[in-house]
Structure formats: C-alpha cells, structure tokens
C-alpha cells in the first residue's frame, strides 16, 4: 500500500513541480525596449518618446504590453525599472542651436483609473557642447524599485530628442518583476 | 492508515522542500567582478579589460565562470547586467596630452558558437579636462536585462584605460540571473 | 482509499503552496528611500545623509529597517543595491563659492560587530559650473550586487549636499534581495 502511495505521490509531485515551475515563469513579467529611431521627434523641449522596439535585437517583452508608446503593466508587483539614454552630436550633423544644453530623462508612471502622471525617476546633466569639439556624447542611467499595479503605464520623456543616439545598445529602458505585492 | 500517510507525506514534503530550496539556490548564478589594476593597458583607444578580481573584497562569483578576461554564462536565463566605470586623473599622475576626452564603456556579448561580438550596452561622455584643474573624475553606470545562453561571454571595453580608477568600489561589473527562459 | 488520499494530498499541497508563497514573500526584503530635504546638511565636504523617507510617495520598506539615517539589513542575502543622486543649482539660489565642483556619492556598508565602514560603490564627476549659465544639473547613478548580513547597515555619503535636488524622483537609494546565501 505505502509503496503505491509513494509512487503516486512522486508522480503527482512531479506534475505539480512542472506546473509550479511553469506558473512561476509566467509570473515574472519583463521588458527591455530599445529606441526606434525612425520616429524620433525634433526640438529641444521635453517630449514623450513613443517609438520603441519590443521584439528585435535586444528588445523583448513578456507578460507586459507595449502600446501607444507606453509599457503597460499586466500584473501587480514590485518591479525594478531602468533606463539608459544616450545623446550625441557630430559637427557633420550641423551646428547646435545652443552650446548650453539640458540633457534629461524622466521615467513616468501613468494611472488610467486616476488619470494622472508622476515622475518615478529622473536623471541627466546640463552640458556645454562647444563648437571647438567635433563630437559630443553623454549618457544617463537611472534605475529604481517600484510598486506597479496592473494597468499602470510606464513612459519615457527626454529633452533634446533630436540628439538621441539611435543605437539599441545606447537608448533603451526596461523593467522586470522582482516580487509580488503582499 | 491516513495518519501514517500524513506523517510520511510531511516527511517527503520536508525533504522535497530542502531539495527545492537547495536547487533554487544553486540555480541562481551571479557575479560581481572588480578591476584588477595591476594589469591595466595604456593607450587612449578602445580596449577590452581582461584583468578582474572574482574572489577578493566585494568580488564574488557563483555558477558563472571567469576566464581569459570574460565572464562566461553557464546557465541559460534572463540576467540583469550592470557596470560601473570610474575615470580619474590627478595632476601628479602626468600631464594630460589632450583636454578633449571620450570616456566610454561598452558591455559586449560574444557567442562562441557563432563567433561574433555584439554591444549590449554603452555609456559615457565626452569631457573637457583642462590642465587648470588639479583633479578630474567621471563615472559611468549602465545596466539592462538580457537573455543569455550557456557558453556566451560578457566582456567590458573602455576608452582611455590608463585613466581608470583602480578602486573596487569604482570600477566593476556584474550580473545576476532573474529568471529562466520559457 | 486512493481517491481519499488524493483529495487529502491536494488539500495539504494547497495549503503548503499558500504557506510557501507567503513565506517567499516575507523572505524578500526591499527598500526604496527618498531624500528628506527638510534636513539636508550644508557645506561642500563629504557628509553622510541621514534624513530619508521610507513610507511616503515612492518610498517604501519591507523586512528591512530604517534607523538613524541608515538602512539596516534584517536578513542575510545577496542584494542589489542602487542609488540615484541629483545635484542642481539655479542662479537665484546665490552664487556658487567655487565653479570647480566635485559631485560625488559613496554607498557605504557598516558592520556593527566589527565596527568598520567600507565603501561598496562610488560615482560622480568633477564639474565646472560656470557663472555664465543660470541653471546647472547633474545626476549620478550607481548599482551593484552585494552580500549583506543581518545587522549590517547601508548609508549614503555625498559631497556638496547643499546642491542636492530634493525631489523624490531625483535623490533616492534602495535595495532588494535577489537570493539567499548558500
């Protein structure tokens, strides 16, 4: 009798382990979105970046949704959010309108239920990009741990979008779920 | 009968829990590698940094391998990768040959199966380090979430390696596994 | 008989799953602390920042303790630590004492058992904030993976604290546990 129970238990446990493992995988949303440079707005004012890749090169998404330029949370949880934004200018691209630049990124959260937008993280620098140098470059990295609810949306705003580096290794943002909400 | 089954089940579950816990621990690779300054190359061009500590001070590694200057993935998964690179110069360390510097880091992935190298993340800044100031410092931080396969290698390239800050709290890179691949 | 065992097993497994899930949640400490600007020290020297929020806005803490300006570890483990520090100055705030600034952050670990303090991560930049520009801004981000023991304390030191940006999206630090220690 007990031998039969043991065998049966092992079988049941095995399938439960598979199920648990599978559900655990499905319960870990993530995204890594890279800039889509075909549609970067011009100007020097703060703008929301809406064109991102989610399924080519390093870009990927799972159990989150990318829609209308926003990363949408499908599952409540605590997430680590990050962004890397690179700005660059070469003299062959024409003269800068001003040598004094404010190169900034803002990672914002929008709640649909209560239509409001809040900045979770910001970073950047004021720069003096003199005409004496033929090439200029600057990168910003921000990251932090935030409670996100299903339906909330993450977006990226930057100043001077025309100076963005369009490479996938340069300008990207992402998120991965670390744990559930108690 | 059912009391005996309960007791047996508790015992089996207990050992399974131990096993699961142990295997989970063993299934979470990580590394935090700090610069080994005894062998930093000179020059101002982009070079791959091959000397890193993996077992002293803050440096540590588990279920990943460090070999030939590269961090080797032993287990498929999604990993969070990061790097912090500090550059510094004091006037006593020699006169700067140029004030216009490009201080950059590139985190690259090399696949052995398909011999190719790709940049996952980059960051940095062009800097004007005038001889009028006795000390200069600049740090770069990059991080991102990437799918890595067993056998793939992560390495760090920088410009101006002779300006690297050799402290373990300054120049380091690392990775930790967040989840399996579906 | 076996049907009864199966039902009983499912019930026991169900409760065990709840318990495991619950204990797993409780076993994942985290903190995200935002600057409390009501008590920022003045001066340009390196100081420890002791005033942080842990329960308002984006700030939160679980299974860690915030006391006397330090984030205290309650549970052994490997943690990802991060900090984002923003400095800014507007001409309306008065003239800077010097245009040459060292804007730095140091993330330190203090062990009570062995009374010693060590820097885990540092970052920053020397900056020339000329009087020609009415506004200056600069952000630092650092992050890394560290083994922390119960009772150890994490604190933040910065240079030029009077220049700190007091916004919760600007100046913060945090930690989350990734895995147990083997």
């Amino acid at each position: 009798g007990s031998q039969h129970i043991r065998a049966e238990k092992a079988m049941v446990d095995g399938s439960w382990l598979d199920l648990a493992k599978r559900s655990k995988l499905e319960a870990q949303p993530f995204a890594h979105l890279t800039i889509n440079a075909t549609d970067i707005p011009s100007g020097s004012h703060k703008v929301s970046l809406s064109s991102w890749y989610h399924d080519r090169g390093w870009a990927k998404i799972s159990n989150m949704t990318f829609s209308n330029g926003k990363l949408i949370v499908n599952q409540d949880g605590f997430y680590y959010l990050y962004a890397n934004i690179c700005f660059r200018h070469h003299e062959t691209s024409g003269d800068l309108a001003t040598e004094y630049l404010q190169l900034m990124v803002y990672v914002t959260k929008t709640s649909i239920k209560i239509p409001s937008s809040h900045t979770l993280m910001k970073g950047g620098s004021t720069k003096y990009w003199s005409g004496n140098s033929e090439f200029h470059f600057y990168s910003i990295n921000v990251g932090g741990f935030f409670k996100l609810r299903s339906g909330e949306e993450i977006s990226i705003e930057v100043s001077n979008p025309s100076l963005l580096d369009p490479d996938q290794d340069a300008t990207y943002f992402g998120a991965f779920k670390v744990r559930d909400i108690d | 009968g059912s009391q005996h089954i309960r007791a047996e089940k508790a015992m089996v579950d207990g050992s399974w829990l131990d096993l699961a816990k142990r295997s989970k621990l063993e299934a979470q690779p990580f590394a935090h590698l700090t610069i080994n300054a005894t062998d930093i190359p000179s020059g101002s061009h982009k070079v791959s940094l091959s000397s890193w500590y993996h077992d002293r001070g803050w440096a540590k590694i588990s279920n990943m391998t460090f070999s030939n200057g590269k961090l080797i993935v032993n287990q498929d998964g999604f990993y969070y990768l990061y790097a912090n690179i500090c550059f510094r110069h004091h006037e006593t360390s020699g006169d700067l040959a140029t004030e216009y510097l490009q201080l950059m880091v590139y985190v690259t992935k090399t696949s052995i199966k398909i011999p190719s190298s790709h940049t996952l993340m980059k960051g940095g800044s062009t800097k004007y380090w005038s001889g009028n100031s006795e000390f200069h410092f600049y740090s770069i931080n990059v991080g991102g979430f990437f799918k890595l396969r067993s056998g793939e290698e992560i390495s760090i390239e920088v410009s101006n390696p002779s300006l690297l800050d050799p402290d373990q709290d300054a120049t380091y890179f690392g990775a930790f596994k967040v989840r399996d691949i579906d | 008989g076996s049907q009864h065992i199966r039902a009983e097993k499912a019930m026991v497994d169900g409760s065990w799953l709840d318990l495991a899930k619950r204990s797993k949640l409780e076993a994942q400490p985290f903190a995200h602390l935002t600057i409390n600007a009501t008590d920022i020290p003045s001066g340009s020297h390196k100081v420890s920042l002791s005033s942080w929020y842990h329960d308002r806005g984006w700030a939160k803490i679980s299974n860690m303790t915030f006391s006397n300006g330090k984030l205290i570890v309650n549970q052994d483990g490997f943690y990802y630590l991060y900090a984002n520090i923003c400095f800014r100055h507007h001409e309306t705030s008065g003239d800077l004492a010097t245009e040459y600034l060292q804007l730095m952050v140091y993330v330190t670990k203090t062990s009570i058992k062995i009374p010693s303090s060590h820097t885990l991560m540092k970052g920053g930049s020397t900056k020339y904030w000329s009087g020609n520009s009415e506004f200056h801004f600069y952000s630092i981000n650092v992050g890394g993976f560290f083994k922390l023991r119960s009772g150890e304390e994490i604190s933040i030191e910065v240079s030029n604290p009077s220049l700190l940006d007091p916004d919760q999206d600007a100046t913060y630090f945090g930690a989350f546990k990734v895995r147990d220690i083997d």
Epitope: - | I40, H89, G94, D95, A97, T98, E99, G131, S162 | -
Partner: antibody, heavy 122, light 108 residues
Framework: EVQLLESGGGLVQPGGSLRLSCAAS????????MSWVRQAPGKGLEWVSG????????YYADSVKGRFTISRDNSKNTLYLQMNSLRAEDTAVYYC???????????????WGQGTLVTVSS | EIVLTQSPGTLSLSPGERATLSCRAS???????LAWYQQKPGQAPRLLIY???SRATGIPDRFSGSGSGTDFTLTISRLEPEDFAVFYC?????????FGQGTKVEIK
Amino acid sequence: EVQLLESGGGLVQPGGSLRLSCAASGFTFSSYAMSWVRQAPGKGLEWVSGITGSGGSTYYADSVKGRFTISRDNSKNTLYLQMNSLRAEDTAVYYCAKDPGTTVIMSWFDPWGQGTLVTVSS
Amino acid sequence: EIVLTQSPGTLSLSPGERATLSCRASQSVRGRYLAWYQQKPGQAPRLLIYGASSRATGIPDRFSGSGSGTDFTLTISRLEPEDFAVFYCQQYGSSPRTFGQGTKVEIK
C-alpha cells in the same frame, strides 16, 4: 617625415628675454601635444614645458614656472617658448619634441629637433 | 617628483659584448611608463624604448628593455660600433616627467 626645426637661440643677459620657435612639418600639428626639453652643457636632460594639441592646457617645470610661457599657433604649425627673467642656470641647448599621441597623458618624446643654444651671460 | 638614478655612470665595453644598464626610481613608476633614449655627441636624443619594453620604430632588436616598479634595465645584446653613446631613462607616469642623469657606454 616628421621634422622639427628650432630657432631663436642666442646670447642674452641675465634678466633678459628670448623667444624660441619650433617649426613642425610632416604631421597634423594640432593633434599632438608638444614639449620643450633642455640640456645644460655637459649635463643631462631636463623637461621644461608642455602644451596640449589645442593649446588649452600648459604645463611647466617648477624651475621655470612664472618666467617661461609655452604657446602654439596651429595655423602656422609652430611651437613657441617665451623666456623672461633669464638666469645663468637657464643656459642650455633647448630641444622641441613631439608627444607620440598614443596615450592620454604626455609621455615620451619622439622625435626631437636638432636644438637651439641659449646662453645667459653678462 | 620621481628621481631616476642610472648606474653605472660609465660602462667600458668592447664591440660584440653585452651591455646592461640600470635605471632605479625613487618611487614606483606607474604602469611601466618608462622610456630609454640614446644620445650621440652633438646630436639630439633618439627614442629607443617606451613602455619599459616596447622597441621604437626602426630600433634594432639587439636593444631590449625590461623591468617594472622601481627597477628597469636596458640591455644591448651585442654592442655594435655605432651603439657607443650616452643613454638616458625617462619616466612619464607622474608629473613632472623626469630623466636619469645618464650612463655613458664607451669603447674599452
């Protein structure tokens, strides 16, 4: 071929001034840091001064600081050393030398000009 | 500043012999940032070695450099008649850049 040709040396009284020139050819002058090195008669070599390619940063040995000024005119491919308040111990052959440009700090000297003799005597 | 001391002051050798010149620094030279020069009478110095051991363009392979930290060596494996001259070491790992006082290699 890289060539460096110094001129402007001669006899000068203590307290007097002299301006040395170094005409460069065979390389993109503005891309390289340059230096002046001197050698007193029968003695060893002493670095005197250096300047970055852009001319934005200048460096001096303590023995000449405040008296000598290094400069360059990149449009003329010429390096200068303005020497004021000259002393007897400044008597030497003055060489101009090119930095290799391979490292971010000024390093070795290659090549050197043939030198110009400065004699400070009353 | 870093003081470089060269020894011996004078080395008397015959053509075909091996010459070993020493350069000792008063403190560690960062990154093996040391160069060697040869100077013949009435001529400007000529670069032989940089980075402690890298031969400059056009320098014969009988010249070799070694060392790190505070002790550096220039070796001429087989002296040729044209090799007799004064040799200087120079460090560039710290400001100011400094030279040794020189070693004269003369024909015995």
